[in-house]
Interface confidence: low
């Protein structure tokens, strides 16, 4: 067990703070909840503290919860591939470029680390080149979320990882908006981290609303499990 992994044996409170600017539309989001890495479970509620969110909530799910991948459940035989927990408590910097097909892009930078007993994800998001009447600024996405695989590989030069995946957002007309994600994570501290073999995270997310909440918000339940490396994976490469 890595030193960081010991911090995730029980339920951990989570705080998410985001400051965003998409095509000049500025906004802030605050999220609170908890994570349980034993089950790979996240429960979070996000509130737009600046009024109405200028982009659809589903476009921010990867920035919020895929940001705290330290809560992913890594099976026993894969624990030596869990970069995310090994970087704790000092944490990691997570940077992404998200390309929305035939539309604009988000660039995000986050610091994910423990502040006391709370896991905090502080994010800056900048979005550019979006069409005002497109799927994103035109709010044409359905309020739901698909399952995805998130592919992870070591980046030895930067003592971190590279991650890429493609998100499928459902559009109200029945079509799909694709969003390419290019991600890199680097540790904040100087301590040793686990550099993984190639594997993936299997994600399942459910979006809902709090009937008692008047502000623009999103409630998220998510389960994330690492996979893709078997007990005998060495045999595959002989």
């Amino acid at each position: 067990m890595s030193k960081g992994e010991e911090l995730f044996t029980g339920v951990v409170p989570i705080l998410v703070e985001l400051d965003g600017d998409v095509n000049g539309h500025k906004f802030s989001v605050s999220g609170e909840g908890e994570g349980d890495a034993t089950y790979g479970k996240l429960t979070l509620k996000f509130i737009c503290t600046t009024g109405k969110l200028p982009v659809p909530w589903p476009t921010l799910v990867t920035t919020f919860s895929y940001g705290v991948q330290c809560f992913s459940r890594y099976p026993d035989h894969m624990k030596q591939h869990d970069f995310f927990k090994s970087a704790m408590p000092e944490g990691y910097v997570q940077e992404r470029t998200i390309f929305f097909k035939d539309d604009g892009n988000y660039k995000t930078r986050a610091e994910v680390k423990f502040e006391g007993d709370t896991l905090v994800n502080r994010i800056e998001l900048k979005g550019i080149d979006f069409k005002e009447d497109g799927n994103i600024l035109g709010h044409k996405l359905e309020y739901n979320y698909n399952s995805h695989n998130v592919y992870i590989m070591a980046d030895k030069q930067k003592n971190g990882i590279k991650v890429n995946f493609k998100i499928r957002h459902n559009i109200e007309d029945g079509s799909v908006q694709l969003a390419d994600h290019y991600q890199q994570n680097t540790p904040i501290g100087d301590g040793p981290v686990l550099l993984p073999d190639n594997h993936y995270l299997s994600t399942q997310s459910a979006l809902s609303k709090d009937p008692n909440e008047k502000r623009d918000h999103m409630v998220l339940l998510e389960f994330v499990t690492a996979a893709g490396i078997t007990h005998g994976m060495d045999e595959l490469y002989k």
């Epitope: 695989n149 493609k166 190639n198 993936y200 893709g228």
Partner: nanobody, 120 residues
């Protein structure tokens, strides 16, 4: 691609696809099929960086996709073949690791295809 041909229902075939090293490495390699008058369908794919596989529901339990890193080759082992498996089968290289299971638009390089015919 190679390995296509004609076979009786219940029989087996093994398709092979060799690609360049740069295309093969840490990419998604997919097998597609297209029957006359039908859309091209992704039947199976594999992420070569980690042996991660995807299968269409129609072939789960019958088809197996595998890889040989030393030969830059992916295989499609097709067992318990049915007449409805008759189609032209294509090997394709994805745009990246995310392409597996994403359909033909997310694949960049395509083979010429090999015909598989299953008779009853």
């Amino acid at each position: 691609e190679s390995g296509g041909g004609s076979v009786q229902a219940g029989g087996s075939l093994r398709l092979s696809c060799v690609v360049s090293r740069s295309t093969y490495t840490s990419n998604c390699m997919g097998w597609f099929r297209q029957a006359p008058g039908k859309e091209r369908e992704e039947v199976a794919s594999i992420y070569t960086g980690g042996g991660i596989t995807y299968y269409a529901d129609s072939v789960k339990g019958r088809f197996t996709v595998s890889q040989d890193n030393a030969k830059n080759t992916v295989y499609l082992q097709m067992n318990s073949l049915k007449p409805e498996d008759t189609a032209m089968y294509y090997c394709a290289a994805g745009r990246g690791s995310w392409s597996c299971g994403m359909g033909p638009d997310e694949y960049k390089y395509w083979g010429q295809g090999t015909q598989v015919t299953v008779s009853s």
